[in-house]
Amino acid sequence: KNSFTKLSIEPAFTPGPNIELQKDSDCCSCQEKWVGYRCNCYFISSEQKTWNESRHLCASQKSSLLQLQNTDELDFMSSSQQFYWIGLSYSEEHTAWLWENGSALSQYLFPSFETFNTKNCIAYNPNGNALDESCEDKNRYICKQQLI
């Protein structure tokens, strides 16, 4: 298990003053309570849910749990110490870690992924750290909508 410590209490995320978030730019117009950054929209929850509940909540907003393209994708919230459920789970059928859309996890994203317990789900910290935890644990979560 990775040795990152989880902080149990942190206020709901608010972007820092130096972060340039997009508001109704050419490629990015996000609904209320969502954050626009680099032509994606993100919903950063303040509630704690199980992984499956989080997945359903994202789906009900026509989005999916966060699928990371690279580790600096969440630069806009790098001040957060919180861990969030993301859309990564182990597929017994494919014997691989898959994102919600079915694509495989790049080994370069989380070099330590081979130590993850395949029965667990993945929680991610915007500084680039990932933890495997029981899917029944409750965490905040991040939903993502790609606009382009």
Partner: antibody
């Protein structure tokens, strides 16, 4: 719990205001819907409103005639029915979205018992 | 709008036997970003409001007996009652919540043979 009221007999072209009193959950946290069912027929979704009340959608069949609204201070959902037609005769149900306020792509986990609206001369 | 078509319109099944209801959508209700099917099943008994049975095509609502199951993906879905009980006599509806307007199938009436 959801309890509808306000149904009744109304003439074509008339108006009616339905209400749905909610209890047992944090009303403002959930989008709410109206669904209707004509006698002996299937279910037809009518309208949805976000938890805050600032976003609404409705079916083409009622657009411009029906207006959904809510009063979160009173835990009450409303449906204003104007320019009523015979084909609007139905039991009107209010139904709670399963997920949160801004989630419109939802199934309904709680329904009221319904209130009957009859449009006839 | 997405049109939901259910078959058959009615179904008579012996007690303890399997009942199968089909639902077809005019376009896919599978969202590629999360591979989830935006489809629910409801049961409605006479004089009562509908009652949620299944959501996300195959997730059983809590409290619903495990003889009810949902399957399918994309445009073709099935509700199965593995062993019909007397209390299962009702009309069953599928609903898509992939896009607004939300739409329901026409219903399937299940009776005892």
């Amino acid at each position: 719990q959801l309890v509808e009221s306000g149904g009744g007999l109304v003439q074509p072209g008339g108006s009616l205001r339905l209400a749905c009193a909610a209890s047992g959950f944090t009303f403002s946290n959930y989008a709410m819907n109206w669904v209707r069912q004509a006698p002996g027929k299937g279910l037809e979704w009518v309208s949805v409103i976000s938890g805050s009340g600032d976003t609404t959608y409705c079916a083409d069949s009622v657009k411009g005639r029906f207006t959904i609204s809510r009063d979160n201070s009173k835990n009450t959902l409303h449906l204003q029915l104007n320019s009523l037609r015979a084909e609007d005769t139905a039991v009107y149900y209010c139904a709670k979205n399963c997920y949160g306020s801004g989630s419109y792509y939802n199934h309904f986990d709680y329904w009221g018992q319904g209130t009957l609206v009859t449009v006839s001369s | 709008e997405i049109v939901m078509t259910q078959s058959p319109d009615s179904l008579a099944v012996s007690l303890g036997e399997r009942a199968t209801i089909n639902c077809k959508s005019s376009q896919s209700v599978l969202y590629s970003s999360n591979r989830m099917n935006y489809l629910a099943w409801y049961q409605q008994k006479p004089g009562q409001p509908p009652n949620l049975l299944i959501y996300w095509a195959s997730t059983r609502e809590s409290g619903v007996p495990d003889r009810f199951s949902g399957s399918g993906s994309g445009t073709d879905f099935t509700l199965t009652i593995s062993s019909l009980q007397a209390e299962d006599v009702a009309v069953y509806y599928c609903q898509q919540y992939y896009s607004i307007p939300l739409t329901f199938g026409g219903g399937t009436k299940v009776e005892i043979k």
